[in-house]
């Protein structure tokens, strides 16, 4: 009978091992080893045993010891098990962005490694074990599916192999893949809320606000705001899980008409959009035309109000008849019309919304000069030594100059408080003069002497 020692060996790939072959008889006819491995006999051996060194063991092998004794031939095998750690442990790339609430499939590939029965593949989140499986196939592929939450954002996932040869080899061999960092995101199914004017006047500034709640991570979200072909430049304010983008928009006459306002919030590989129609309009203030802004009293004046062809105007609070963009009326200018305001108000309906504009013009009426009994009485009787204020008001536009003289030289102090003396008595000629001509009026002052008892 042939014996082999050790009957089983676990050795690293490329390693060497000494194997003893022995025969049961004292003087075997022949004793040896059959193996494809490089072998060297270690001398001196014994009568019935031989020691061989097997080197560069690359794979599992079963070298056979044989002996030929008088009582017959026999053989015995030793079991060489080669171990080696995997040459490649790789976690498949993670998606650039993973939606929260969707399952993530982790895939790990393991190339090489033996013995496979002792090789375990683990998928890890940080140091937490998610899955442990045997390595099957070449390359071995291990997958697991995990739910993804917001707390997984920035988490490292990796794959680790364990070659456990205990108790034969006291050491546990570990290989870990390069970690992959997961980026998760949460973009709600609701579109952004867009607050903007429904109508916008050419050359005026409007404000557009686009906001969305329930975003994660909000700092990674991008906002795009555009009105037609005009890209807007918003100021973005970030909240806990929300953002608000505010932009000013100014439109030109070329953009008149219906434009699409678009707000897009991009996060991860997804976008939520809201579109709104904005009507851009042009609405100049109405025109108020007077046949002449300055006329003489008695002149007929046409006051005309004209606005945007689709507008409806009112002139001094009176609607055009029929309602439309033009209104007018005729008046005969009187002094009372001097400084009179003519207001034209226009209402334009733009996409169902009403917008208003107005314009005011003033009429100047030239009249006078005028000296009336009411404002310049022809007779005054005052007690001597009393305090009096002679009054005489001349009217006209332009405002006339007034002089009241007695005998062409002595002035009556109009509008001044005076002590009545005999000198004040007499007839004064009051003359009101403007660029439009002059008028005169006689004013008599009588002074009453005090009675002495």
């Amino acid at each position: 009978q042939t014996s082999v020692f050790p009957p089983e060996v676990i050795l690293p790939r490329g390693g060497s091992v000494k194997v003893n072959c022995s025969a049961s008889c004292d003087q075997p006819i022949s004793l040896g080893m059959e193996t494809p491995l490089p072998k060297k006999e270690i001398l001196p051996g014994g009568n019935n045993w031989k020691m061989y060194e097997l080197s560069n063991v690359q794979e599992d092998s079963q070298p056979m010891c044989y002996s030929n004794c008088p009582d017959g031939q026999s053989s015995a095998k030793t079991l060489l098990t080669v171990y080696w750690t995997p040459e490649r442990v790789e976690l498949a790339p993670l998606p650039p962005w993973q939606p929260v609430g969707k399952n993530l499939t982790l895939r790990c590939q393991v190339e090489g490694g033996a013995p496979r029965a002792n090789l375990t593949v683990m998928l890890l989140r940080g140091e937490k074990e998610l899955s442990r499986q045997s390595a099957v196939g070449e390359p071995a592929e291990v997958t697991t599916t995990v739910p993804v939450g917001r707390d997984d954002h920035g988490a490292n996932f990796s794959c680790r192999t364990e070659l456990d040869l205990r108790p034969y080899v006291l050491k546990l061999f570990e290989n870990t893949s390069a970690p992959h960092q997961l980026q998760t995101f949460d973009l709600p199914a609701t579109p952004p809320q867009l607050v903007s004017p429904q109508v916008l006047e050419v050359d005026t500034q409007g404000t557009v606000v686009c906001s969305l709640d329930g975003l994660f991570p909000v700092s990674e979200a991008q906002v795009s705001l555009a009105l037609g072909d005009q890209k807007l430049n918003p100021t973005i304010t970030y909240g806990n899980n929300s953002l608000s983008a505010k932009a000013s928009v100014k439109v030109t006459a070329e953009e008149e008409g219906t434009q699409q306002l678009l707000c897009g919030v991009m996060l991860g590989n997804q976008t939520q959009e809201t579109r709104q129609t904005v009507t851009i309009y042009s609405f100049p203030a109405p025109n108020v035309n007077l046949t002449k802004p300055e006329v003489s009293e008695g002149t007929e004046v046409i006051v005309e109000c004209e606005a945007h062809p689709r507008a409806k105007v009112m002139l001094n609070g009176v609607p055009a008849q029929p309602p439309g963009p033009r209104a007018q009326f005729l008046l005969k200018a009187t002094p009372e019309d001097n400084g009179r305001s003519f207001s034209c108000s226009a209402t334009l309906e733009v996409a169902g919304q009403l917008v208003h504009k107005n314009q005011t013009r003033e009429l100047r009426v030239l009249y006078g000069p005028r000296l009336d009994e009411k404002d310049c009485p022809g007779n005054w009787t005052w007690p001597e030594n009393s305090q009096q204020t002679p009054m005489c008001q001349a009217w006209g536009n332009p405002l006339p100059q007034l002089k009241c003289l007695k005998d062409g030289t002595f002035p009556l102090p109009i509008g001044q408080s005076v002590t009545v003396t005999r000198d004040l008595e007499g007839t004064y000629l009051c003359q009101a003069r403007s660029t439009r001509g002059e008028v005169t009026r006689e004013v008599t002052v009588n002074v009453l002497s005090p009675r002495y008892e």
Partner: antibody, heavy 122, light 110 residues
Framework: QSVEESGGRLVTPGTPLTLTCTAS????????MSWVRQAPGKGLEWIGI?????TTYYASWAKGRFTISKTSTTVDLKITSPTTEDTATYFC???????????????????WGPGTLVTVSA | GYDMTQTPASVEVAVGGTVTIKCQAS??????LVWFQHKPGQPPKRLIY???TLASGVSSRFKGSGSGTHFTLTISGVESADAATYYC????????????FGGGTEVVVK
């Protein structure tokens, strides 16, 4: 000046129905006209408006479900494909007024018809 | 659009009492606000226009106030005939998708 609705009746779901509003004492070419409805147990709901020139605007829920049109003396409301939800009293109202102090026009339902009842039932 | 929020949805008031109904617009509507009284089987009745102007034939017990976005209808010396639903209506816009009326306030007179 008055407005009066007509054409309300019992219809089966899906059967188009046209309601008519007849204006008296004023010209539709000078006014905007609105249609408003009230479903049983519900509040007043604005359906839409037609301008003096014939432009129409609708509430978001009414778009595609109603069509407003006009002639020189009448304003029509067509319920394109009635459902039981459209059971209501339908009112026509003149919806245009002006303010002399500011000189501006504004929307104001100052003249209403008595209403016409539409019942949609299978 | 111009969302019109009316409060309260319902209010109970004793005869002779005072009731206040509020209406808030989501954007300024200046003074273009109308108040209506609506009773079952009748067309709505215009009470107040231009926020505070009393419509002809309407009792002076009805008073409207406010401008911009906040408006109030006050009914003083409430009578049993005042039991109705009251609506505010903005007169600024009739754009596509617009909200024209408030949700209504039911006034119950005890």
């Amino acid at each position: 000046q008055s407005v009066e609705e007509s054409g309300g009746r019992l219809v089966t779901p899906g059967t188009p129905l046209t309601l008519t509003c007849t204006a008296s004492g004023f010209s539709l070419s000078n006014y905007y006209m609105s249609w408003v409805r009230q479903a049983p147990g519900k509040g007043l709901e604005w359906i839409g408006i037609i301008s003096d020139s014939g432009t129409t605007y609708y509430a978001s829920w009414a778009k595609g479900r109603f069509t407003i049109s006009k002639t020189s003396t009448t304003v029509d409301l067509k319920i394109t494909s009635p459902t039981t939800e459209d059971t209501a009293t339908y009112f026509c109202a003149r919806d245009w007024s002006y303010d002399s102090s500011s000189g501006y026009y504004y929307y104001d339902m100052d003249l209403w018809g008595p209403g016409t009842l539409v019942t949609v039932s299978a | 659009g111009y969302d019109m929020t009316q409060t309260p949805a319902s209010v109970e008031v004793a005869v002779g009492g005072t009731v206040t109904i509020k209406c808030q617009a989501s954007q300024s509507i200046n003074s273009w606000l109308v108040w209506f009284q609506h009773k079952p089987g009748q067309p709505p009745k215009r009470l107040i226009y231009k926020a505070s102007t009393l419509a002809s034939g309407v009792s002076s017990r009805f008073k409207g106030s406010g401008s911009g976005t906040h408006f109030t209808l006050t009914i003083s010396g409430v009578e049993s005939a005042d039991a109705a639903t009251y609506y505010c209506q903005q007169g600024y816009s009739r754009s596509d998708g617009e909200h024209v009326f408030g949700g209504g306030t039911e006034v119950v007179v005890k």
